[in-house]
């Protein structure tokens, strides 16, 4: 559960985030799992640890392997694993499946292609974009911040899109590329104001102290591919990542489902080892799209364990 696949190309920068997160003040130690050797933090090293991030500047094929990160707080340690694979650069234009990030779908009205993993890097706009290895040119293509917008999408726009950017580390520049497939759907859908199906508004969820608990935020947004629809959890009005409680984590990525033909998204909030103080928090399921934003609030209450009499 706390293991993450990461991949990159030799001679490019690769930055990996520890799958276990904590407050910025917590120390994070990194180890190469096979040898249990500590990863240095000095930036003069080609591979070094920087808090929650493990940096390969640049990466080499020999760096492949499993890396362990341990998030240390005054009261607990949390362990995560990063499974890193560095591949040799291909001589031809083909990008093999194992280098591809998740496929995105688009339509005439929805044609954003996000550059994968870019938020981990120190980069400056503009991004360079390529389709099937050809640099994209023409007014139909617009590189905007971390994504590419294609105007008047046609079926011929389907293909593999590569973003290329420069990571800067202490004045040194490293190239990074990432590729994902883009498919074009015939859009006969519609979108509407988010409708949160779960949890119910002001729901009280019973949990057992010391056990794990899951909360699911589920919302529907319309029919067909949905543009900029998202669901997420907030704790006491702040983002989960900003709240800084490592026991409480949002699942990475949103799961898409279809309910009565409607496009829905859900996001699971996992609370490990439920504590008394978790009962005092307010958990907000937030759903938003181009129409607006909706919230439902949940609170936790203690479930009394059933007494077992002999």
């Amino acid at each position: 559960k706390f293991s993450k696949q990461s991949w990159g190309l030799e001679n490019e920068a690769l930055i990996v985030r520890c799958p276990r997160q904590g407050k910025p003040s917590y120390t994070v130690d990194w180890y190469y799992s096979q040898t249990n050797k500590s990863i240095p933090t000095q930036e003069r090293n080609r591979v070094f640890a920087s808090g929650q991030l493990l940096k390969f500047l640049p990466a080499a094929v020999a760096d492949s392997g499993i890396y362990t990160c341990i998030v240390r707080s005054p009261t607990f340690n949390r362990t995560g694993y990063a499974n890193v694979t560095i591949y040799k650069k291909q001589s031809d234009c083909n990008v093999p499946d194992y280098l591809m990030y998740s496929t995105v779908s688009g339509s005439e009205k929805n044609s954003k292609i996000y550059c994968p993993t870019i938020d981990l890097y120190n980069w400056t706009a503009p991004l360079e974009w390529f389709k099937n290895c050809q640099a994209l040119q023409g007014s139909r293509y617009r590189a905007h911040k971390s994504f590419l917008v294609i105007d008047n999408v046609m079926t011929e726009d389907a293909g593999d899109y590569t973003c290329k950017f420069i990571h800067n580390e202490n004045g040194a520049n490293y190239s990074v590329t990432a590729t994902r497939s883009f498919t074009v759907k015939d859009e006969q859908g519609f979108s509407l104001f988010p409708v949160i199906g779960a949890p119910a508004q002001n729901e009280i969820k019973e949990v057992e102290i010391g056990k794990n608990a899951n909360l699911t935020c589920s919302a529907c947004f319309g029919k067909g591919t949905q543009f900029l629809a998202a669901v997420l959890w907030q704790l006491n009005g702040t983002k989960i990542t900003d709240f800084g409680e490592p026991r409480i984590q949002q699942e990475e990525g949103q799961n898409q489902s279809f309910s009565n033909g409607l496009a829905c998204l859900d996001m699971v909030l996992r609370i490990a080892d439920v504590k008394e103080e978790d009962l005092l928090l307010q958990y907000d399921c937030l759903a938003l799209n181009l129409h607006g934003l909706r919230r439902h609030t949940v609170r936790l209450s203690r479930k009394n364990p059933i007494d077992h009499h002999s």
Epitope: Q201, N202, Q282, D284, L290, G292
Partner: antibody
Framework: EVQLLESGGGLVKPGGSLRLSCAAS????????MSWVRQAPGKGLEWVSS????????YHADSVKGRFTISRDDSKNTLYLQMNSLKTEDTAVYYC???????????????WGQGTLVTVSS | DIQMTQSPSSLSASVGDRVTITCRAS??????LAWYQQKPGKAPKLLIY???TLQSGVPSRFSGSGSGTDFTLTISSLQPEDFATYYC????????TFGQSTKVEIK
């Protein structure tokens, strides 16, 4: 020091257009959501429009939907409100306001400009 | 849309008085509530957010409380500069909505 300076207000006939601008300084403009709020003479505050820091999300009040468009130019640290098909009931002081949080959805406004008056009258 | 109802619409008080303004939401808004102060001819100023968090630089005589549908702004000891109009605002759902205002006047 955070500063927001609105401009572009004035007298316009019903059905006309205006473009309001808000020049921002003293903070990292591109990191924050921004909003427009208006206040008709002698009346209360009415939220008009908000835009997320990345420009993905642009929300408008029902009273202006389809007529007003919010946008931003991070390279110029400027927020805009394009107002078309203006009505007499759009007469108000228009305030530009900065989101109090990196998160667009917090909705709190921690710094406001001094406002620009828009008068719609024939 | 969520309606915000403030009471009273106006009140008269003296310097040193304890003043309480209430704001009621037409549906639960958790703690997504802010309070603003506005003086004539000036822009509004954020006082309290998340129902009870004091904005940086705001005097500690201002406090906020409440959750769900009922909220309160309290000024523990009214000062001359506090005579102004106050607004509550919800940001639980879009559209964000404001209360109709409470004017605090000198008795």
């Amino acid at each position: 020091e955070v500063q927001l300076l609105e401009s572009g207000g004035g007298l316009v006939k019903p059905g006309g257009s205006l473009r309001l601008s808000c020049a921002a300084s003293g903070f990292t403009f591109s990191s924050y959501a921004m909003s427009w709020v208006r206040q008709a003479p002698g009346k209360g505050l009415e939220w008009v429009s908000s835009i997320s820091s990345d420009s993905y999300y642009k929300y408008h009040a029902d009273s202006v939907k389809g007529r007003f468009t919010i946008s931003r130019d991070d390279s110029k640290n400027t927020l805009y409100l394009q107002m078309n098909s203006l009505k007499t009931e759009d007469t108000a002081v228009y305030y530009c306001a900065k989101g109090a949080d990196y998160d667009f959805w917090s909705g709190y406004l921690d710094y406001w400009g001094q406002g620009t008056l828009v008068t719609v009258s024939s | 849309d969520i309606q915000m109802t403030q009471s009273p619409s106006s009140l008269s008080a003296s310097v040193g008085d304890r003043v309480t303004i209430t704001c009621r939401a037409s549906q639960g808004i958790s703690s997504y509530l802010a309070w603003y102060q506005q003086k004539p001819g000036k822009a509004p100023k954020l006082l309290i957010y998340r129902a009870s968090t004091l904005q940086s630089g705001v005097p500690s005589r201002f406090s906020g409380s409440g959750s769900g549908t009922d909220f309160t702004l309290t000024i523990s000891s009214l000062q001359p500069e506090d005579f102004a109009t106050y607004y509550c605002q919800q940001s639980y759902n879009t559209p964000w909505t404001f209360g109709q205002s409470t004017k605090v006047e000198i008795k």
